[in-house]
């Protein structure tokens, strides 16, 4: 049976005095030499040998300081043996415990604690909670924690409470007003014992938010501007305001509405962000003959909503603006700003030359009818295609579009039409766009088996080549052109196969050069900027089929109109 | 459980200066040990350099005491050593482990020893 | 210069009983614990002894120590090949703070 006891040990102290500060030992030792052998934390585990025990007569002595929040106890585990190292007893577990001195502060989680807090919260209201911890032991006074406020910054009337136990920061006040006072700064002491002990201090930073608890004032009671009739204005007028919110938040923001005399929409407000300054912005024309005097009102409020502990103090109050209207002479312009002109279908793009659009002239803006004394000239006229006639304003083309035109544009060019009035010097500018031709990208070219044919077979075989494989869209159709002249059919045109096809003159013809002109249409019926022109050269033959002399050259002959079709 | 883990800069040259830094993980530094410094030069000894505790008091070895400091930084849970004017001498694994130091009590000896240690970093010293 | 003197190196064959001495002056080993490491190679040290002859939990009762005025040493009976180590001596100096002994190296002869 084992009999034994141990005495609690102070952390931090020099326990030595009361060694042995536990005994254990065995009944078996009346009667055989036992051995007392202990283990566990603090003896052969770390910390290793706080503990040592007499074998002899199992007195446990503490060797050194230890430290309760380290161990707050020790479990000994302790054995008597035998002279023949046999258990006599089974292993008997002794609990030292550590008693607890009040040797750590508390200490806060944070050096400073950062909150914030809306101006104008109720009393009472939850600012932040302050935490702090105590390595003591728990439940303890010792590890207590009881929370002041050691001071204010600024200093004056307090605006803050702290709970002494929870650590809570409340306001102690419903005046917290952000406009005077934007933020204060605490020192807070948490001590231990209850707040007797030992103690450690902290910071805390407390913003005021800002809330929409001032209405934005215009600083005039009255605003007045000129302008000339029939021109815009970005910055007729500037509106300044003063609002003591926080600058560059939306409570600070003004919004600048009209509260009447704007119902033609000739104005707007718009709020320079930087200033809070509202632009008036004239963005339709006035016209002196109709209106010379303009009267409205306008107010200001905020971009936010206002707090709820005004909201009910606002009412909208209306500032007059005036603005005076300018006489000046209007002079011309073109109605519309821009016209647009089609070139008739079946007009060839290298026939253009001469082909006349229409007119295009301008306007007075005072008669509403067309200018008089006025000179027309072409601003920008990309490719000088068009000209202009400066009196009447007839607009035709000059030159052929090119199919590698850069400045067609979805089909249309476009150019600048300027009217100078020759009265003031004044200019108004209009813009012509025209609808031009389409180039079918897909023709085919018509050649020729062979250039020289013989009066005594006058036939050759024509075949078609796409330029373009991956854009071939045939069936094609290939015709001569049609002759104004009513003259006898002297060629024709014979399908062979799929991509080939015959030549042949109808009757008989002299040696001589030849151009055949041929017409090339895709399916989609799309002319295309032909017709091509083919030379041929008709000559007296030898036996071999080799011209015999050189033909000199000759009027072409076209005539008739025949057609073949290639393709499926 | 905690495991202490050495990291450096790597070599170092002459005269200048060797810093290490010890990260101590699972556990916190601000326990009741000794956090201590240790280097062995290539095939030879262990030489103790120094320990600090958590409230910043140091043992600092005598014969390095000059050229030496040991911090502490609490926040991130490690502890540092500076070795300054370096040379060929201070080439050494330097190991970081965690240090028992308790004064007896009359009648008793000091307990001095290291239960815990990192796996060791090599520094050398060349130009 | 070193305050704890150690063997360079001692050698037995396995089942052999070694010992390694370890001596130094009143003001460490006279006056306060000592402490035995051993470090196999390529780690870290490891503590053997506390308390001059204590075992912490783990080690092998194979290993024992023993302190007699300014001296102390290690006994290792029945060796084994995984006893191939070096192993040093420790103890505080109330002068010049922790010192170590030079260290021995254990060698397994086979």
């Known amino acids: 049976e084992w009999v034994k006891f141990a005495k609690p040990c102070r952390e931090r102290e020099d326990n030595s005095r009361r060694n042995p500060i536990a005994k254990i030992t065995s009944d078996f030792q009346k009667n055989q030499k036992i051995t007392y052998r202990i283990s566990g934390v603090g003896i052969d585990q770390p910390p290793f040998g706080i503990f040592v025990v007499d074998p002899n007569n199992g007195d446990i002595n503490i060797t050194a300081i230890v430290d309760r929040e380290e161990t707050p106890s020790f479990l000994i585990t302790c054995r008597a043996l035998n002279a023949l190292g046999q258990d006599v007893e089974r292993p008997l577990i002794l609990t030292v415990k550590i008693l607890d001195v009040n040797d750590n502060p508390p200490i806060f989680s944070q050096t400073i604690f950062k909150g914030e807090i809306e101006e104008n919260s109720a009393s009472n209201s939850l600012v932040m909670i302050l935490n702090a911890t105590d390595a003591d032991e728990p439940n303890h006074m010792n590890s207590k924690i009881a929370f002041k406020i050691v001071s204010q910054e600024p200093a004056g009337m307090s605006m803050f409470l702290i709970s002494r136990n929870t650590g809570e920061v409340r306001t102690l006040t419903s005046s917290l007003d952000r406009e005077q006072i934007s933020s204060y700064h605490l020192v807070v002491s948490g001590a231990d014992n209850d707040g007797t002990g030992l103690s450690t201090q902290c910071e805390c930073s407390i913003k005021i938010k800002d809330v929409n608890d001032n209405f934005p004032v215009l600083r005039e009671s009255q605003y007045s501007a000129r302008i000339e009739e029939n021109t815009l204005n970005a910055e007729l007028l500037r509106f300044q305001v003063t609002d003591w919110d926080e600058e560059y938040t939306d409570n600070w923001l003004a919004v600048y509405f009209f509260t009447s005399g704007n119902e033609g929409n000739w104005f707007e407000i718009e709020t320079d962000p930087r200033t809070n300054e509202g632009i008036l912005k004239v963005v339709k024309a006035l016209d002196y003959e109709q209106v010379q005097s303009m009267q409205f009102s306008i107010a200001v409020r905020n971009k936010a909503e206002f707090h709820q502990s005004v909201i009910s103090q606002y009412r909208v109050q209306s500032t007059p603006v005036t603005i005076q209207v300018i006489d000046v002479r209007e002079g011309i312009s073109f109605r519309p700003p821009s016209k647009t002109f089609t070139v008739q279908r079946g007009v060839s793009t290298n026939k253009l030359v001469g082909y006349i659009l229409g007119t295009y002239q301008a306007t007075d803006e005072d008669t509403g009818k067309a200018a008089s004394s006025v000179r027309y000239v072409l601003g920008r006229n990309d490719g000088g295609l068009l000209v202009i006639d400066s009196k009447t304003a007839q607009i035709k083309f000059v030159k052929n579009i090119d199919r590698d035109s850069t400045f067609i544009v979805n089909k249309t060019i476009s150019a600048e039409v300027l009217a100078i009035d020759e009265n003031t010097g004044k200019t108004s500018t209009g813009t012509i766009y025209v609808e031009v031709p389409s180039f079918n990208e897909n023709c085919p070219s018509v050649v020729l088996e062979k250039k020289d044919i013989c009066t005594s077979s006058p036939s050759v075989t024509l075949s078609v080549r796409t330029l373009d494989r991956g854009k071939y869209t045939g069936p094609y159709t290939v015709s001569l052109e049609e002759q104004p002249l009513k003259l006898p059919v002297m060629w024709t045109i014979t399908t062979l196969n799929a991509t080939s096809a015959l030549l042949q003159a109808q009757q008989q013809v002299s040696p001589g050069v030849y151009n055949v002109p041929v017409i090339v249409k895709d399916n989609q019926d799309g002319l295309c900027d032909t017709p091509e022109s083919l030379t041929l050269t008709v000559c007296q033959c030898d036996d071999r089929s080799m011209c015999r002399a050189p033909i000199p050259s000759r009027e072409p002959n076209t005539y008739g109109e025949s057609s073949w079709r290639l393709g499926p | 459980q905690v495991q202490l883990q050495e990291s450096g800069p790597g070599p170092v040259k002459p005269s200048g200066t060797l810093s290490l830094t010890c990260g101590v993980s699972g556990g916190s530094i601000s326990s009741n040990h000794w956090w201590t410094w240790v280097r062995q030069p290539p095939g030879k000894g262990l030489e103790w350099i120094g320990e600090i505790y958590h409230n910043g008091s140091t043992f600092l070895n005598p014969s390095l005491k000059s050229r030496v400091t040991i911090s502490v930084d609490k926040s991130n849970n490690q502890f540092s050593l500076k070795l300054t004017s370096v040379t060929a001498a201070d080439t050494a694994v330097y190991y970081c482990?965690?240090?028992?130091?308790?004064?007896?009590?009359?009648?008793?000896?000091?307990?001095?020893?290291?239960?815990?240690w990192g796996r060791g970093t090599l520094v050398s010293v060349s130009s | 210069e070193l305050v704890l003197t150690q063997p360079p190196s001692v050698s037995g064959t396995p089942g052999q009983r070694v010992t390694i001495s370890c001596s130094g002056s009143?003001?460490?080993?006279?006056?306060?614990?000592v402490y035995w490491y051993q470090q196999l190679p390529g780690t870290a040290p490891k503590i053997l002894i506390y308390?001059?002859?204590q075992r912490p939990a783990g080690v092998p009762d194979r290993f024992s120590a023993s302190k007699s005025g300014t001296s102390a040493s290690l006994a290792i009976s029945g060796l084994r090949s995984e006893d191939e180590a070096d192993y040093y001596c420790?103890?505080?100096?109330?002068?010049?703070?922790?010192?170590f002994g030079g260290g021995t190296k254990l060698t397994v002869l086979q």
């Open positions: 009143s003001s460490h080993i006279g006056s306060n614990y």
């Open positions: 420790a103890a505080w100096d109330d002068g010049q703070g922790g010192v």
């Open positions: 308390s001059n002859d």
């Open positions: 482990a965690r240090g028992w130091h308790r004064t007896g009590f009359r009648g008793y000896p000091s307990h001095w020893y290291f239960d815990l």
